[in-house]
């Protein structure tokens, strides 16, 4: 969709991982004066929502309240602006935003090798495992907008596991992992218990600004 106006922006508050039965606000905004905003979802159940734009200080926006969260509401969202209503003249679409429902299945376990406290520069690997036959595991770090994902390995000792090599440790952080199944990519398990990774001998434990991730499955992504 080329659109007669440039694309609006789409944000999720408080974030794109939404627990079952909770609500997420998807905010569509632009510095173009759009009278209408349309929010379109692709996924298990497609839908389009419409709101009239609000205008403040040269910004047009619409806050779409999505919830109580359930599987049909998870998917890839894009928002469009329109200056007219009948017919709509749609802008280019916003960048896609994947909204994931969590809390559907049993939580996996998260552990660190060699342990959750490591020396600066030492390599650390986080392992996510479960007796449930998850196809994918997703690792998130508190304060970062994106997760990295790995395919689960074959069943070993009754569990399915994925290892996330974090590389040489420079900064600590609180990590969680989730499991999901191949045919339901937007439907994730309960979160693992949080795992605090501490880096000792580090002059600063402040976080780097999150970098734009590569989202290729199976590519190690450094969340440190």
């Amino acid at each position: 969709h080329e659109g007669v106006h440039r694309k609006p922006s789409l944000l999720a508050h408080p974030g794109r991982l939404v627990k079952s039965e909770e609500t997420v606000i998807l905010q569509c905004w632009s510095d173009v004066r759009f009278e209408h905003f349309l929010l379109h979802r692709e996924g298990k159940f497609k839908d389009t929502l419409h709101l009239i734009g609000e205008h403040h200080d040269g910004v047009s926006k619409a806050n779409f309240s999505i919830g109580p969260m359930m599987q049909d509401l998870a998917g890839t969202y894009r928002c469009y602006g329109s200056v007219t209503h009948s017919p709509y003249q749609l802008s280019a679409p916003s960048d896609p935003l994947d909204i994931v429902i969590t809390g559907l299945y049993e939580k996996p376990s998260l552990s660190a090798q060699p342990g959750p406290t490591v020396l600066a520069g030492e390599s650390v690997t986080l392992s996510c495992s479960s007796r449930s036959s998850y196809d994918m595991y997703h690792l998130s770090r508190e304060g970062e907008a994106h997760e990295c994902r790995f395919s689960a390995g074959p069943k070993v000792n009754g569990t399915f596991q994925a290892d996330f090599p974090l590389g040489p440790a420079t900064h600590g952080g609180t990590y969680r992992c989730f499991g999901s199944f191949r045919d339901s990519p937007y439907e994730w398990s309960n979160s693992s218990d949080p795992l605090l990774v501490s880096v000792t001998g580090n002059p600063s434990n402040s976080w780097p600004s999150p970098t734009e991730p590569s989202s290729k499955t199976g590519n190690p992504r450094h969340l440190h």
Epitope: K44, D47, M70
Partner: antibody, heavy 124, light 108 residues
Framework: QVQLVQSGAEVKKPGSSVKVSCKAS????????ISWVRQAPGQGLEWMGG????????NYAQKFQGRVTITADESTSTAYMELSSLRSEDTAVYYC?????????????????WGQGTTVTVSS | EIVLTQSPGTLSLSPGERATLSCRAS???????LAWYQQKPGRAPRLLIY???SRATGIPDRFSGSGSGTDFTLTISRLEPEDFAVYYC?????????FGQGTKLEIK
């Protein structure tokens, strides 16, 4: 005042197809959620699927997947439901219905406006 | 799919009485995604309640809905002659959207 007006009754042979239309007047058809619901004689209601015309995206109940096609023509504010490989069990009244759309409604699955219904009889 | 079971199948009451219709789901349905309809012979259904408890436009306040999880209720506080019809509950919280089999409300 929004109205949905459906096409007339149809008599079809088993194995054939039927296409029912639903013309909307009033309101903004583009962003409507138009669903199709059927009711066999003396039976309850059954949701078949629906469409939102502006993006042409349709959802179907698994039971009808592959046999039903729901489309919409924005230029004429008309939605269509085509059901193929008809059998006697498809004899029913077919309704189009608009999903309630207010700012606090996130799923347009409660149907506030209905067409008058189209009777489809499948008989050899 | 979510199966909705309505009870009773038939309810015989007199005008002026209170009617209580039940709808039970085979699995939990968020109360935001449950509706009630009234249908008279030869007519299309009419939306009464959405979101389990919100009255649709133009519906008299003698109709009220309540419930959560798997148990939902439609109450008609004082039956009017025009209320005798078939009532359906419907969930739209999980596709495919499904309806109950209906409760027939008849004059005693």
């Amino acid at each position: 005042q929004v109205q949905l007006v459906q096409s007339g009754a149809e008599v079809k042979k088993p194995g054939s197809s039927v296409k029912v239309s639903c013309k909307a007047s009033g309101g903004t058809f583009s962003s409507y959620a138009i669903s199709w619901v059927r009711q066999a004689p003396g039976q309850g209601l059954e949701w078949m699927g629906g469409i939102i015309p502006i993006f042409g995206t349709a959802n179907y109940a698994q039971k009808f997947q592959g046999r039903v096609t729901i489309t919409a023509d924005e230029s004429t504010s008309t939605a269509y439901m085509e059901l193929s490989s008809l059998r006697s069990e498809d004899t029913a009244v077919y309704y189009c219905a608009r999903g309630l759309d207010t700012p606090n409604v996130v799923v347009k699955g409660a149907f506030d406006i209905w067409g008058q219904g189209t009777t489809v009889t499948v008989s050899s | 799919e979510i199966v909705l079971t309505q009870s009773p199948g038939t309810l015989s009451l007199s005008p002026g009485e209170r009617a209580t219709l039940s709808c039970r789901a085979s699995q939990s349905v968020s109360s935001s995604y449950l509706a009630w309809y009234q249908q008279k012979p030869g007519r299309a259904p009419r939306l009464l309640i959405y979101g389990a408890s919100s009255r649709a436009t133009g519906i008299p306040d003698r109709f009220s809905g309540s419930g959560s999880g798997t148990d939902f209720t439609l109450t008609i506080s004082r039956l009017e002659p025009e209320d005798f019809a078939v009532y359906y509950c419907q969930q739209y919280g999980s596709s495919p959207w499904t309806f109950g089999q209906g409760t027939k409300l008849e004059i005693k």
